[in-house]
Amino acid sequence: EKAMVDGSWLDLAKRSKLEAQPFAHLTINATDIPSGSHKVSLSSWYHDRGWAKISNMTFSNGKLIVNQDGFYYLYANICFRHHETSGDLATEYLQLMVYVTKTSIKIPSSHTLMKGGSTKYWSGNSEFHFYSINVGGFFKLRSGEEISIEVSNPSLLDPDQDATYFGAFKVRDID
């Protein structure tokens, strides 16, 4: 019986530690996509509706803030699309890019952790165009560091929650 009690306590401890593991999955807020044809920062994301969730991390001023030191897996998926019903592309040659950036407040600095994308030729003869970028990587992050997303040509972003999102989850502590 004692062994069973110890076992269940161990399970509970494990479970509570898992529940405390920081994670975030943020989806684009389609009502507030910035304009611009160059690189712009995406600052409006959902954290508590649909697929979006956050735990033991903070979302503030368009940035995902780390609350616990650790090794994290970061990911971002960005979809670009254009349908002729919305008008014509002013240029058919496009650079469609995403940049995942880490900003440190303590030692003011900013680093691009990941970037992805391509130059595309989206011919005016086609009714519909679509392009998806997915980046992911394993990074050591410290409490207070902030993760943000920049993209080119935000007017072409696919606003669906299953198309444009980013997130992070802690994998292990820093030894």
């Epitope: 304009s35 919305s86 008008g87 002013a90 240029t91």
Partner: antibody, heavy 126, light 103 residues
Framework: QVQLVQSGAEVRKPGASVKVSCKAS????????IHWVRQAPGQRLEWMGW????????KFSQKFQGRITVTRDTAASTAYMELRSLRSEDTAVYYC???????????????????WGQGTLVTVSS | EIVMTQSPSSLSASVGDRVTITCRAS??????LNWYQLKPGKAPRLLIY???SLQSGVPSRFSGSGSGAEFTLTISSLQPEDIATYYC?????FGQGTKVEIK
């Protein structure tokens, strides 16, 4: 205030060419596209083509492809539309119109024509 | 190619009347639909863009509604200066126009 001022009326013989100008003022010419639209007597408005005043890119209606040239002079903030091999059915009022999309803020030509020129009557008659 | 069809082609109404013009697209165009007013010898004027957004400077008696393939332009209280031909438009396609006259 934004203004588009077009050149005066023209009379041409069939087979000839006509070039209509559209001078823009009151905004940054290079940040917007200019469309050309015409209306023949008793007919609906008909879109002909556009030019991105910033980079000179153009797009034309299939109907006019090969007969139309649209150019711009950014220094003069002026767009030009030339139509060649004129026939009597080309008798119409030709309008230039500004696309409402600011190219500095995005890359989609939205086909919202927020400002128009006063129109240029082109008469094709032998 | 999308075709825009307006109805009626002409109408006659009294000052103060509520006037409705319909525009149908041959396929769904979401809300990408604009309305213009054309008076003889004058530059066309954008009234409504994106199906329901009122262009700045346009009187509030003009309103637009609809999405998909069916749209309407409404003049809530017809005024003498509203005598004109009205056109709906989606990108490269215009409707055939509706001529509005005063009874």
């Amino acid at each position: 205030q934004v203004q588009l001022v077009q050149s005066g009326a023209e009379v041409r013989k069939p087979g000839a060419s006509v070039k209509v100008s559209c001078k823009a003022s009151g905004y940054d010419f290079s940040n917007y596209a200019i469309h050309w639209v015409r209306q023949a007597p008793g007919q609906r408005l008909e879109w002909m083509g556009w030019i991105n005043a910033g980079n000179g890119n153009t797009k034309f209606s299939q109907k006019f492809q090969g007969r139309i040239t649209v150019t711009r002079d950014t220094a003069a903030s002026t767009a030009y539309m030339e139509l060649r091999s004129l026939r009597s059915e080309d008798t119409a009022v030709y309008y230039c119109a500004r696309d409402s999309s600011n190219m500095a803020r995005g890359i989609i030509i939205a086909y919202y024509f927020d400002y128009w020129g006063q129109g240029t009557l082109v008469t094709v008659s032998s | 190619e999308i075709v825009m069809t307006q109805s009626p082609s002409s109408l006659s109404a009294s000052v103060g009347d509520r006037v409705t013009i319909t525009c149908r697209a041959s396929q769904s165009i979401s809300r990408y639909l604009n309305w213009y007013q054309l008076k003889p010898g004058k530059a066309p004027r954008l009234l409504i863009y994106g199906a329901s957004s009122l262009q700045s400077g346009v009187p509030s008696r003009f309103s637009g509604s609809g999405s998909g393939a069916e749209f309407t332009l409404t003049i809530s209280s017809l005024q003498p200066e509203d005598i004109a031909t009205y056109y709906c438009q989606h990108t490269r396609a215009f409707g055939q126009g509706t001529k509005v006259e005063i009874k």
